[in-house]
């Protein structure tokens, strides 16, 4: 049925889906706080621009009776149920914030006549790529894939003189929502990553992973996995690792690596950690004291979703344009807006761009150091530490295939 949008005559409402099944186990109270903070800032920004309008949020809660797994497994129907609730109440805002689960976002996008923008903190999977009215404010799998291909091909850095074309991917099915979709994208036979690699095998059992570490007949020296250092330790323990093994640990939403007093454990010496830059600038190879540990990416994405809506509302109101139009619904992309922690850039498809950081463990200091950064917006790698104190021979990353000469 056609649902009227509460989105005109100086009153603009945001519908916030508060789903029991969520990409991250963040208390709903934290998400509410984030949304309310965003509203206070948006109201201030609009007032400063001379726009005397009302902006509010309506929180739509799931009853939690049926869809109570707490993770994303039963989110498909929960999302549609919430939309039905909105429809029955005949109350839809100018914009929909949430859901965060790939399953629910994909299904909601598929099953609704979306003439309004959808902003998601999550929806990491490839199935949510290239959706015309969907904006994603946490790095989706496609961005990770593009970094990996770019890094694999790189062969002109002092510390990486070989192109790589092979990889193992460890994926045991117990991953968090973000990791599940990141690894799913790497596993998919039709993905860009698979297309660009000559050899790729998915390791699904702990024993498979453990055996590869010292297997002389392994087909690749590179293993990609997703999670934190503790996850790796549980799997690897203190087992011996062949000297030319490189583990790429994808841990985007974890900034513990940037804390002042963190020392890298010994089992991390063969590991390169891929994470997100915690600040707007991270140019020197040893971390500045001005970087704070703030594990809050999920709630922050909700907050930035509110600020993004405020940004677009301001532009359309200043131009005298209608908000309840397809033009507005399709406008949440190819732009930069002032987010809570600084400027936020969205690409042509409404996906957030960011600076990814590849870290290594210094054998001298036992600290995490920045090896390189990668700008997802321009798909470009920027080396930071030209002479890293690696564990690998000659302070260079090894070839991906043992015994193969320069490529």
């Amino acid at each position: 049925s056609q649902v009227s949008q509460n989105c005109h005559n100086g009153s603009y409402e945001i519908s916030v889906l508060m789903m029991g099944n969520s990409a991250f186990a963040e208390p709903l109270k934290n998400l509410e706080d984030a949304v309310n903070e965003g509203l206070e800032i948006v109201r201030g920004r609009l007032q400063n621009a001379g726009l005397n309008v009302t902006v509010n949020a309506t929180f739509m809660y799931s009853d939690g009776l049926i869809h109570n797994s707490g993770d994303c497994r039963s989110s498909t129907c929960e999302g549609l149920d919430l939309l039905r609730k909105i429809s029955n109440a005949q109350r839809m805002g100018c914009v929909l914030i949430g859901p965060s689960c790939t399953y629910s976002t994909f299904q909601m996008y598929l099953d609704t006549e979306l003439s309004y923008p959808m902003i998601s903190a999550g929806s990491f999977g490839l199935s949510c790529d290239y959706k015309e009215t969907l904006t994603r404010l946490m790095s989706p799998a496609r961005k990770l894939m593009y970094f990996l291909v770019n890094f694999w091909k790189t062969n002109d850095l002092p510390f990486k003189t070989y192109s790589w074309s092979t990889s193992y991917v460890y994926k045991n099915g117990t991953e968090t929502e973000d990791c599940f979709w990141y690894l799913n994208a790497l596993e998919a036979s039709v993905s860009y990553f698979s297309h660009e690699l000559g050899f790729k095998v998915v390791l699904r059992q702990d024993k498979e992973f453990q055996d590869i570490l010292m297997d002389h007949n392994r087909k690749s020296n590179v293993i990609i996995m997703c999670g934190g250092p503790e996850f790796l330790y549980k799997l690897k323990g203190d087992r011996a690792v062949a000297e030319d093994i490189v583990i790429i640990l994808v841990d985007l939403f974890n900034d513990q690596y940037f804390e002042d007093n963190v020392t890298a454990p010994d089992y991390m010496k063969n590991v390169l950690v891929l994470t997100l830059s915690p600040g707007n600038s991270l140019l020197n190879s040893s971390f500045s004291r001005n970087l704070s540990p703030t594990k809050r990416d999920f709630a922050l994405a909700y907050l930035n979703g509110i600020l993004l809506f405020g940004h677009m509302l301001k532009i359309f109101l200043e131009n005298g344009e209608n908000i309840t139009t397809p033009k507005f619904a399709h406008a949440f992309r190819n732009l930069t807006f002032e987010g809570y922690d600084g400027p936020v850039t969205l690409d042509d498809w409404g996906d957030v761009d960011s600076t990814m950081v590849l870290l290594y463990t210094s054998v001298d200091t036992k600290k995490y150091k920045v090896l390189l950064t990668y700008d997802t917006h321009v798909n470009k790698t920027y080396p930071v530490d030209m002479s890293p104190t690696f564990t690998w021979k000659n302070s260079k990353l090894p070839n991906d295939i043992t015994g193969r000469g320069p490529q």
């Epitope: 934290n30 706080d33 984030a34 800032i41 920004r45 970087l291 809570y340």
Partner: nanobody
Framework: EVQLVESGGGLVQPGGSLRLSCAAS????????MTWVRQAPGKGLEWVAK????????YYADSVKGRFTISRDNAKNSLYLQMNSLRAEDTAVYYC????????WGQGTLVTVSS
Amino acid sequence: EVQLVESGGGLVQPGGSLRLSCAASGFTFSRYWMTWVRQAPGKGLEWVAKIRHDGGEKYYADSVKGRFTISRDNAKNSLYLQMNSLRAEDTAVYYCTRDYNKDYWGQGTLVTVSS
């Protein structure tokens, strides 16, 4: 350990001024939005003013707009609230808080506006 310590409160006559300070420690002050919040006797919490990490944006509740000014000095890890033209209804305990979820609070400083 994160600490926020407010000071500068006291008894002032209507129409008078006060300057509140908040000394922050235990975290990188320059990376956080900060907010002044107040609680009047027998009332709920009300946000008063907020300021971006670099001081580039400042917002005020309608009830204090034009009378109060929020500022910060990142070099000194300090937050300030200049309160002018004080009214009886500004009587409250004033707290400084950190970030969107206001995860850390000080002990507060009492401002009493009375003749």
